[in-house]
């Protein structure tokens, strides 16, 4: 039968190539059975994950899963890095895998690399 533990569906070693200046929503898909857990986002700094206190977040509910969303409006160059969501459930802390944002700081739309170029060039960081 289905587990009633909270599960956080962020893929291990997942990456997103995004453009500075664009809006972006980072989703933490959350599966739970009864009461929705308290979920937070943090940003990795070395081995510690620093809680993101003053950032805009929201919930999106779907039939079988909920999404805790971290909003970037807009994406800034220093948003580059790895993020993790965590859920508090019955006094347990459940942590997701980390997901990495690669932010490309492009000056004009004409200079923007294609999605395929960005996917294969994660060294284009600022």
């Amino acid at each position: 039968k289905e587990s009633c533990d909270v599960q956080l569906y962020i893929k291990r070693q997942s990456e997103h190539s995004i453009l500075a200046g664009d809006p972006f929503e980072l989703e933490c898909p959350v599966k739970y059975c009864a009461n929705r857990p308290h979920v937070t986002w943090c940003k990795l700094n070395g081995t510690t994950c620093v809680k993101l206190e003053d950032r805009q977040t929201s919930w999106k509910e779907e039939k079988n899963i909920s999404f805790f969303i971290l909003h970037f409006e807009p994406v800034l160059p220093n948003d580059n890095g790895s993020y993790r969501c965590s859920a508090n459930f019955q006094s347990n802390l459940i942590e997701s895998h980390s997901t990495t944002l690669y932010v490309t700081d492009v000056k004009s739309a004409s200079e923007r690399p294609s999605k395929d170029e960005m996917a294969s060039r994660p060294w284009l960081l600022y």
């Epitope: 893929k11 997942s14 990456e15 997103h16 190539s17 980390s98 999605k115 395929d116």
Partner: antibody
Framework: EVQLVQSGAEVKKPGESLKISCKTS????????IHWVRQMPGKGLEWIGR????????KYSPSFQGQVTISADKSISTAYLQLSSLKASDTAMYYC????????????WGQGTLVTVSS | DVVMTQSPLSLPVTLGQPASISCRSS???????????LNWLQQRPGQSPRRLIY???KRDSGVPDRFSGSGSGTDFTLKISRVEAEDVGVYYC?????????FGQGTKLEIK
């Protein structure tokens, strides 16, 4: 039933290009990473790269970077491996594999596509 | 790149006897999430590979319990408690902790 069905065997000439497909069913392709692996005749397995069908992000082995393009169309649950400027040394069996991305709970392999490059 | 070294490369075994394959990695496969991403694959003659073991010791569904995986860090072992005829083929270890992911050279298991 879980299936990864790859396109059929191909015979190509040097310099030509080729796109192999891997049609998945029985699971949600967005929950997985699709890997591509090469096996040259009588040899071992070599990791080419992987694609995240959920967002299109792709990672390549440096040994294959620039020689291949990996992609996926999540709307039809199909992954692709494109080989360009084929050489005789590209003759090999190419496998797709689908691994669950969250907890590694499954890892399925396609039946392989034999590519022969010969003038 | 992480180099995966298997031994032996050839393993003749008598039916019903145990078999053991070693896999060593050139660096630790322990990921920052505390898990170790080491898989064992079986490739029977003329077939595509099949995952037997993941996360060092977890058996895939449908894999007989005579197969077991163990190890940590850089040193891993696949054991078959009693070899059967259907176990003939090549066994590969595969790490997916560090990019690029890498395979061992393969160990060919044959019946004596």
């Amino acid at each position: 039933e879980v299936q990864l069905v790859q396109s059929g065997a191909e015979v190509k000439k040097p310099g030509e290009s080729l796109k192999i497909s891997c049609k998945t069913s029985g699971f949600n392709i967005k929950d997985t990473y699709i890997h591509w692996v090469r096996q040259m005749p009588g040899k071992g397995l070599e990791w080419i790269g992987r694609n995240d069908p959920a967002n299109g992000n792709t990672k390549y082995s440096p040994s294959f970077q620039g020689q291949v393009t990996i992609s996926a169309d999540k709307s039809i649950s199909t992954a692709y491996l494109q080989l360009s400027s084929l050489k005789a040394s590209d003759t090999a069996m190419y496998y797709c594999a689908s691994y669950e991305g969250y907890y590694e709970r499954f890892g399925y392999w396609g039946q392989g596509t034999l590519v022969t490059v010969s003038s | 790149d992480v180099v995966m070294t298997q031994s032996p490369l050839s393993l003749p075994v008598t039916l019903g006897q145990p078999a053991s394959i070693s896999c060593r990695s050139s660096q630790s496969l322990l990921d920052r999430d505390g898990k170790t991403y080491l898989n064992w694959l079986q490739q029977r003659p003329g077939q595509s590979p099949r995952r037997l073991i993941y996360l060092v010791s977890k058996r895939d569904s449908g894999v007989p319990d005579r197969f077991s995986g163990s190890g940590s860090g850089t040193d891993f072992t696949l054991k078959i408690s009693r070899v059967e005829a259907e176990d003939v083929g090549v066994y590969y270890c595969w790490q997916d902790t560090h990019f690029p992911y890498t395979f061992g050279q393969g160990t060919k298991l044959e019946i004596k």
